[in-house]
Interface confidence: low
């Protein structure tokens, strides 16, 4: 079953996916696509790497993390309810039947009046992120609102992989990662 | 708009450490990446490495064994040490911003680095 | 590591002729990932085009970039006298970051 994460309306939404490339610069494409992962490739890509860099993104779909060292979590940015819904992260290892598939299901909930929880807050403190909409429309900046709920039961045990960067760390234990080579 | 500000010695030992800091203003420095590019008198640019904001590093092969790029989110700034200099080290020092989409977008001024005795 | 070689080293042109700028890559570059920068002396480089063919915020529809692969063309299609500077190309897909050396574009 799929790992649930949860965003309220207006806030950024972070799916979590990551993988430990074979060495510095040898990228492994990656796509994200709304709808679980079908046999091949993703469906509905939203967003999209190749062996060097990100080749495609759509207007509120960003990856925020060090995408060349294998952090290729997704954010989106000021999520409506109609975002809801299971997400593909494909990492597409070369070989036939390689790609690991993540499936994440987002579920977004109605903005609420109160305060975030502490824990939300105190990650956003400590990792604040841009999201620059250029290419898109005027520059605008937010900072990522929500962290996931996590069932720690569904972690994947390759994240300790993820060395090079400490944001890929502190977030190691709510991504799916895999190590490539 | 985004603008950056190079500071340090001008003047560096040889052996010593050659030590720079950017800050960024106009803007956060948590957004991709923040990179060093050095270039000697009269010739072209040499990429040092770059930074993430999150501390993640990638460093030119060439110069590697000797640089380290940190960041300071709390100041929105990132800083360069280049140990165990020598004269070949002498260049002007610029630092840049690096979208990774977009390429190096916003540049400093730059400043002048000489490693002399 | 990608090796950019950069010709003509120096182009001697009159104000308001073309200039045609060349940069060739010791391997394929994914267009998207290549860059042009302008430098004039004293000052840092100021970007002018990324994704081989994109123009940056501000710059004049005079420059246009062209290319794919290993061959990367920058053209100024009437130089203004504010136009005569070095310019640099640069890949920034590929580990380590690579610029070539240089084509001045200088007064005739």
């Known amino acids: 079953s799929e790992v649930e994460y949860r965003a309220e309306v207006g806030q950024n939404a972070y799916l979590p996916c990551f993988y430990t490339p074979a060495a510095p610069g040898n990228l492994v494409p990656v796509c994200w696509g709304k709808g679980a992962c079908p046999v091949f490739e993703c469906g509905n890509v939203v967003l999209r790497t190749d062996e060097r860099d990100v080749n495609y993104w759509t207007s509120r779909y960003w990856l925020n993390g060090d995408f060349r060292k294998g952090d290729v979590s997704l954010t989106i940015e000021n999520v409506t309810l109609a975002d809801s819904g299971i997400y593909c992260c494909r990492i597409q290892i070369p070989g036939i039947m390689n790609d690991e598939k993540f499936n994440l299901k987002l579920v977004i909930k109605p903005a609420k009046v109160t305060p975030a929880p502490t824990r939300q807050r105190d990650f956003t403190a400590a990792f604040p992120r841009m999201l620059t909409t250029r290419g898109h429309g005027p520059a605008e900046t937010q900072t990522l609102g929500s962290l996931p709920d996590i069932n720690l039961t569904q972690i994947s045990t390759l994240a300790n992989e993820l060395r090079d960067s400490r944001l890929a760390n502190d977030l190691r234990d709510s991504g799916a990662t895999i190590r490539i080579g | 708009q985004v603008q950056l500000q190079e500071s340090g010695p001008g003047l560096v030992k040889p052996s010593e450490t050659l030590s720079l800091t950017c800050t960024v203003s106009?803007?956060?420095?948590?957004?991709?990446?923040w990179s060093w590019i050095r270039q000697p008198p009269g010739k072209g640019l040499e990429w040092i490495g770059y930074?993430?904001?999150?501390?993640?590093?990638n460093y030119n092969p060439s110069l590697k064994s000797r640089v380290t790029i940190s960041v300071d989110t709390s100041k929105n700034q990132f800083s360069l040490k280049l140990s165990s200099v020598t004269a070949a080290d002498t260049a002007v020092y610029y630092c840049?911003?690096?979208?990774?989409?977009?390429?190096?977008?916003?540049w400093g001024q730059g400043t002048t680095v000489t490693v002399s005795s | 590591e990608i090796v950019l070689t950069q010709s003509p080293g120096t182009l001697s042109l009159s104000p308001g002729e073309r200039a045609t700028l060349s940069c060739r890559a010791s391997?394929?570059?994914?267009?998207?990932?290549l860059a042009w920068y302008q430098q004039k002396p004293g000052q840092a480089p100021r970007l002018l085009i990324y994704?081989?063919?994109s123009r940056a915020t501000g710059i004049p529809d005079r420059f246009s970039g062209s290319g794919s692969g290993t061959d990367f063309t920058l053209t100024i299609s009437r130089l203004e006298p504010e136009d005569f500077a070095v310019y640099y190309c640069?890949?920034?897909?590929?580990?380590?970051?690579?610029f070539g050396g240089g084509t001045k574009v200088e007064i005739k």
């Open positions: 930074i993430h904001y999150t501390g993640s590093t």
């Open positions: 840049a911003t690096d979208t990774g989409y977009y390429g190096m977008d916003v």
């Open positions: 391997q394929s570059v994914s267009s998207s990932y």
């Open positions: 994704g081989a063919s």
């Open positions: 106009g803007g956060s420095i948590s957004r991709y990446y």
């Open positions: 640069q890949q920034y897909g590929s580990s380590p970051l690579t």
